[in-house]
């Protein structure tokens, strides 16, 4: 007769490993006992279990509660055992020794390989700012056995680069995603996708992109200069910009302090009933942590008793 086994058995971390050992004997041959041992654990063999045809299964103390026989029906020539809840430390070499009658003893070895699913981590790169060149947006690292696959899922245009480092039978994979930051990328998801034979489904980690920028400032409210006349109520100037982080606004008057009664409400400058005192050059200052912008306008309050309207100049400066 001969022993049938596998030279390598693969199991996912936490699952049960079947260690096969089947005696294919001639008619009338019987298996008396099967002894299982781990044989790569340093000095000598470490007993796992003894499977006796008459007395059943005896598990050594080190493996108490972890070694069982496969569920029935059982073939009396089958010396296979189940190793419950495989851990990485179980990875190694095992031997079954089969005592048969009348053919004598046989032995076979197998190697148990434990697949270790990765626990990926995503690390954002440095702060992204519009105007930068190709910049690291994020890196994603996953270590497992065997090597995980790390890819990216995103609508954002960019380039990826990967590097891998191998341990014995496991590997750490790092993938980097580089892009040229633009404001259109703000709020866009960048997802690291990790695949591995030990995972039922891909693992995904999503990072939301934040790109610092500040748009040019402009002032709205002077489109119809004829509305800016003495006595008009509800006149206002509104400063237009956008940015990330959201910008703050400040209003000043270039040719003196803001006239009394003029209200500053964030991006809006509200005027009381207009007088000629409100004529002047107004500056909107827009700033965030990334940059600052200015836009200035000239307000000329018209006297309806005068025939000719006045020109209104809009000047933007950065």
């Amino acid at each position: 007769g001969e022993l049938e086994t596998s030279d390598v058995v693969t199991v996912v971390l936490g699952q049960d490993a079947k260690l096969p050992c089947f005696y294919r004997g001639d008619s009338g041959e019987q298996v008396g006992q099967v002894a299982w041992a781990r044989v790569d654990a340093g000095e000598g063999a470490q007993e796992l279990a003894l499977l006796h045809s008459k007395y059943g299964l005896h598990v050594s103390p080190a493996y108490e509660g972890r070694v069982e026989q496969p569920p029935p029906p059982r073939n009396p020539l089958d010396g296979s055992v189940l190793l419950r809840n495989a851990v990485q430390a179980d990875e190694g070499e095992y031997e079954c020794r089969v005592s048969t009658f009348p053919a004598g003893s046989f032995q076979a070895r197998l190697r148990l390989r434990v697949l270790v699913p990765p626990l990926p981590s995503l690390n954002p790169g440095p702060a992204l700012e519009e105007g930068q060149g190709l910049t690291l947006a994020a890196s994603c690292t996953a270590e497992g056995s065997p090597a995980p696959s790390v890819t990216w899922d995103t609508e954002v245009k960019g380039t990826t680069s990967s590097r891998s480092f191998k341990h014995s039978r496991s590997a750490a994979v790092t993938s980097e995603f580089h892009l040229v930051p633009s404001r259109s990328m703000n709020g866009q998801p960048l997802t690291c996708v990790v695949s591995h034979p030990g995972l039922l489904q891909d693992q995904r980690i999503t990072h939301i992109l934040h790109v610092s920028f500040l748009a040019e400032a402009s002032v709205r409210g002077l489109e119809d200069q004829n509305l800016w006349h003495i006595g008009r109520e509800g006149a206002m100037l509104k400063c237009l910009s956008e940015g990330q982080p959201p910008p703050s606004y400040n209003w000043t008057r270039l040719d003196g302090p803001l006239p009394s009664g003029v209200r500053v409400d964030g991006d809006t400058l509200g005027f009381p009933p207009l007088t000629t005192e409100h004529s002047g050059i107004y500056v909107c200052h827009v700033s965030n942590e990334f940059s600052s912008r200015d836009s200035q306008v000239t307000v000329d309050v018209l006297d309806p008793q005068e025939d000719s309207g006045k020109q209104v100049d809009l000047v933007s400066a950065s």
Epitope: S6, D7, V8, T10, D40, G42, Q88, A89, R111, R113, P146, A147, S149, S164, F165, K166, H167, S168, R169, A171, V173, P197
Partner: antibody, heavy 115, light 113 residues
Framework: EVQLVESGGGLVQPGGSLRLSCAAS????????MHWVRQATGKGLEWVSA???????YYPGSVKGRFTISRENAKNSLYLQMNSLRAGDTAVYYC?????????WGQGTTVTVSS | DIVMTQSPDSLAVSLGERATINCKSS????????????LAWYQQKPGQPPKLLIY???TRESGVPDRFSGSGSGTDFTLTISSLQAEDVAVYYC?????????FGQGTKVEIK
């Protein structure tokens, strides 16, 4: 019997290419990471490349971009495609199986790069 | 990259005497998650491929005589042949398989005095 047999070595001019093969038998090839290691005459061992069970590949800086390791599990075969060969690549090339360290080695195939 | 340095480069020992080879790695090869040192020792005889003797710094490969033993942790390792036999004449290499690029020591030649 567990065995690795290399082939494909020979004489090649600088700048030329060569493809080495390693035939595996006696074990479940697809379950093992595999390596190429080289040894110049009278010199020590130098690790050349590795490939994992899922096809992940690894190289030292000395051969990166010039050498490509691959495997064909259905044929129990390991390959090393060597391009832009240099005199310094002259060596005996061994394929090896990794378990804890490299536990099985082939007998090696000789690559000579010379004009 | 991890650099492996062996000492001495060569060693002459009388039959039956102890031979000791040292190997130093430029950084630790101890993997904290399983407390194993990813270091192997190989024996290479003339005209033959290397043969794995020791892995995890101190675990003997199956079939290797017990006169061969390995010790050490972190960055400093030792291969000891407790009683040198004629068939032990060879070059011995240490190798780290902690991370790629895997690297070997330059080798130590053991001869009989």
């Amino acid at each position: 019997e567990v065995q690795l047999v290399e082939s494909g070595g020979g004489l090649v001019q600088p700048g030329g290419s060569l493809r080495l093969s390693c035939a595996a038998s006696g074990f479940t090839f697809s379950s093992y990471d595999m390596h190429w290691v080289r040894q110049a005459t009278g010199k020590g061992l130098e690790w050349v490349s590795a490939i994992g069970t899922v096809g992940d590949t690894y190289y030292p800086g000395s051969v990166k971009g010039r050498f490509t390791i691959s495997r064909e599990n259905a044929k129990n075969s390991l390959y090393l495609q060597m391009n832009s060969l240099r005199a310094g690549d002259t060596a005996v090339y061994y394929c090896a199986r990794e378990w804890n360290g490299m536990d099985v080695w082939g007998q090696g195939t000789t690559v000579t790069v010379s004009s | 990259d991890i650099v492996m340095t062996q000492s001495p480069d060569s060693l002459a020992v009388s039959l039956g005497e102890r031979a000791t080879i040292n190997c130093k790695s430029s950084q630790s090869v101890l993997y904290n998650s399983n407390n194993k040192n990813y270091l192997a020792w190989y024996q290479q005889k003339p005209g033959q491929p290397p043969k794995l003797l020791i892995y995890w710094a101190s675990t003997r490969e199956s079939g290797v005589p017990d006169r061969f033993s390995g010790s050490g942790s972190g960055t400093d390792f030792t291969l000891t042949i407790s009683s040198l036999q004629a068939e032990d004449v060879a070059v011995y290499y240490c190798q780290q398989f902690y991370t790629t690029p895997y690297s070997f020591g330059q080798g130590t030649k053991v001869e009989i005095k």
